[in-house]
């Protein structure tokens, strides 16, 4: 689809006569018929088939055209076609005089043609004008045309549609040839797909509008080369999507059993060492002079009861002194200047003389001890509770309570952290002083065996005779296509020999 | 256990700002994207900003683009959203959430309110 | 943005009850699809996610089915503490997009 322009320029026709040589009365008024049609050897009369105008009376015998409306009429003068430009036409131009108003053929005498003239030829598509004059024996006819393509059609020959847009079908001008050209950030045969941030990932990203980077469910940053470990994920990264690697001093399917409670907490005070031993459970070794779980205790040097025979500890700068009860002395009261006539055993013992009555000794029931019966025994004394656990007095016995991850009377044995048997598929368990490691059986992996792999059972090269191997996914067994000739699980058999 | 706390909300009038904190704790927080999801009186849930764990790539619902802007302090565990030129309709719950917006929102803050009213 | 249709608005059911809530999206989201519950006052907690994937700590009697765009959260046997109001998610396409709700009130 197309127009093809021409521009009356300027006529001349000095004397003011028609074609047949008479003069116009009272000058010629001069109108012009046009007629454009397909390409003719000889330009004969017949239909218009490309199109025909006519104008407006322009002027009076000689007279240039304006290059706009003249009288209602427009310069260049249009004839639009719907069609495939063919690259050629024929085109005839006729002058007519016009006596009256009315300038329909029908309404005019034969003999008011002033001039005719019919040129035909190759014509391109182009923006520039090709001018031309045609001289007759009384008149001239300067004039210029061109064929243009309507909005929206491109090509040589006018037959490309294009338009441009914006939105969601496409983002593109029109080159002068009819090719899409995208707007900037766009990409595509109908410029329809963005152009993501540059270096924004293949796979893990994509745009719906240029320079955007939107990641695919399971990875994140600016270009979705980082992945998002697992949604109940506590103290792990990932290396793909939905992982859960434990950082160091962390356990557990979601990285949320602490197996470094001694850096994590500090539980140890006073200055004390810390030891991890297993799942959030630790070992204070204290400092001298301090005591407790978490060695929080600090210690008196009268608090180990050194001074006998009822004597009175009081703590001192340097240690600690006795104040011994009468008929005691010594450094612990440890010496008596008592008898048994002094009934000087407490708590039911009974006294026995000594050195002929110069000394005594006393024998003490159950739950009493000291030179004098006079202290309850404290089975707790000689901390006989392993890994920290705490002595409990019990009347004439005494109890553990031991700390989390440790068993036994005394607490001297490690509860296993395999006990609940946390390696899946098969997996072995091994307790380790940071925790438990898991051996997973071939086909798994993962900290405790959760992850199924799948198993090469190729790798042996199980089939005999050049068969394809296949593993099979769903029982991880090989299998052995075999070629012409042989047969068997592994092909081993050549055909006819039965096996043995 | 994991634990998102959210503070800064509060009656501002149109045109005003706003800061929200989350702090978090429980789990490490460098390595999560976390999100601001939000929730208007009567109304259902609207996703607002995520931003990425270790780069802090943000991302944001249209209606608060230029206007809201998602922040994080790995050192501190601490979410920030700065809200500027509020508007009636940002009134809302405003929930601190771990999780981007192509995955789950698996934790939750208690959330805290924010009331745009003259 | 993907609309997420979640069906009934509200329902009135009983202890022990079975109880399915639907989430329907306007175009495929695959599996990414997760489902909350919120109590009055309370904020959202992940029940399920991948469609079918139960969230650590929630109790069995909780599934999700689905695939394409329709998905489906099943309580199997109600208990009192199941009434609140549930949230379908997804999370293929940006922005993410929640559904409007489903009201679970006791009968």
């Known amino acids: 689809s197309g127009v093809f322009q021409l521009q009356l320029q300027e006529f001349v026709n000095e004397r003011g006569v028609l074609a047949s040589g008479r003069p116009c009365e009272p000058g010629c008024r001069t109108f012009f018929r046009v007629c454009l049609k397909h390409f003719q050897a000889v330009v004969s009369p017949g239909p218009c088939t490309f199109g025909s105008v006519s104008t407006p009376v322009l002027g009076t015998n000689s007279f240039a055209v304006r290059d706009d409306s003249s009288g209602g009429g427009r310069n260049p003068l249009q004839l639009p076609f719907n069609f495939t430009w063919p690259g050629t036409f024929s085109l005839i131009i006729e002058a007519w005089h016009a006596p009256g108003d009315d300038l329909r053929p029908e309404a005019l005498p034969p003999d008011a043609l002033i001039s005719k003239i019919a040129i035909q030829g190759s014509l391109a598509v182009g923006q520039n004008w090709l001018l031309d004059e045609q001289t007759s024996t009384l008149t001239r006819l300067r004039y210029s045309y061109r064929v243009i393509c309507s909005d929206n059609y491109y090509g040589d020959n006018c037959s490309r549609l294009c338009k441009k847009r914006n939105d969601h079908f496409g983002h593109y001008v029109c080159q002068p040839d009819g090719n899409l050209s995208c707007l900037p950030g766009w990409t595509g045969e109908y410029c329809q797909q963005p152009i993501c941030l540059s270096g924004c990932h293949e796979q893990n990203g994509y745009c719906s509008k240029p320079a955007e980077c939107l990641c695919r469910p399971g990875w994140q940053g600016r270009l979705c080369n980082e992945c998002i470990p697992h949604n109940g994920c506590r103290h792990g990264t990932c290396s793909t999507p939905w992982q859960c690697t434990c950082d160091e001093g962390w356990g557990g399917l979601f990285c949320d059993q602490d197996l470094n409670y001694c850096t994590h907490h500090s539980p140890c005070k006073n200055g004390a060492t810390c030891s991890n031993s297993g799942q959030r459970s630790y070992t204070c070794t204290c400092r001298p002079g301090y005591t407790g779980v978490d060695c929080e205790l600090e210690l008196s040097e009268c608090d180990s009861n050194p001074c006998r025979n009822g004597g009175s500890c009081k703590d001192q700068e340097d240690g600690y002194h006795c104040l011994c009860p009468p008929g005691y002395y010594g450094l612990h009261c440890e010496h008596s200047t008592l008898s048994c006539a002094d009934s000087p055993c407490f708590n039911g013992g009974s006294c026995r003389e000594r050195n002929q009555g110069a000394s005594y000794a006393c024998e003490c029931p159950p739950n009493f001890t000291g030179s004098n019966c006079e202290k309850k025994v404290d089975r707790c004394t000689s901390n006989p509770c392993a890994n920290g656990g705490q002595c409990l007095n019990r009347g004439p016995s005494r109890m553990c309570r031991c700390r989390p991850g440790f068993t036994g009377t005394y607490c001297e044995r490690h509860v296993s952290d395999c006990a609940r048997n946390p390696c899946a598929h098969g997996g072995t368990c091994h307790d380790l002083e940071s925790g438990l490691m898991c051996t997973c059986p071939a086909g798994f992996s993962g900290r405790r065996c959760e992850v199924r792999t799948s198993i090469d059972a190729c790798a042996s090269s199980p089939c005999f005779n050049r068969a394809t191997c296949y593993t099979d996914l769903s029982t991880d067994t090989f299998v052995c296509n075999c070629p012409y000739g042989f047969v068997g699980s592994r092909c081993e058999f050549p055909v006819g020999l039965p096996p043995s | 256990e994991v634990q998102l706390v959210e503070s800064g909300g509060g009656l501002v009038q149109p045109g005003g700002s706003l800061r929200l904190s989350c702090a978090a704790s429980g789990f490490t927080f460098r390595y999560f994207p976390m999100s601001w999801v939000r929730q208007a009186p009567g109304k259902g849930l609207e996703w607002v900003a995520s931003?990425?764990?270790?780069?802090?790539?943000?991302s944001y619902r249209d209606s608060v683009k230029g206007r809201f802007t998602i922040s994080r302090d790995n050192a501190k565990n601490s979410l920030y959203l700065q809200m500027n030129s509020l508007r009636a309709e940002d009134t809302a719950v405003y929930y601190c959430?771990?999780?981007?917006?192509?995955?789950?929102?698996?934790?939750w803050g208690q959330g805290t309110l924010v009331t745009v009213s003259s | 943005d993907i609309q997420m249709t979640q069906s009934p608005s509200s329902l009135s059911a009983s202890v022990g009850d079975r109880v399915t809530i639907t989430c329907r999206a306007s175009q495929e989201i695959y599996r990414n699809l997760a489902w909350y519950q919120q109590k009055p006052g309370k904020s959202p907690k992940l029940l399920i996610f991948d469609t079918s994937v139960l969230a650590d700590g929630v109790p069995s009697r909780f599934s999700g089915s689905g695939s394409g765009t329709d998905s489906t959260l099943t309580i199997s046997s109600l208990q009192p503490e199941d009434f609140a109001t549930y949230y379908c998610?997804?999370?293929?396409?940006?922005?993410?997009?929640f559904g409007q709700g489903t009201k679970l009130e006791i009968k």
């Open positions: 931003i990425s764990g270790s780069d802090g790539w943000a």
């Open positions: 998610q997804q999370y293929t396409y940006y922005p993410p997009t």
């Open positions: 959430a771990r999780g981007y917006y192509n995955s789950p929102f698996a934790y």
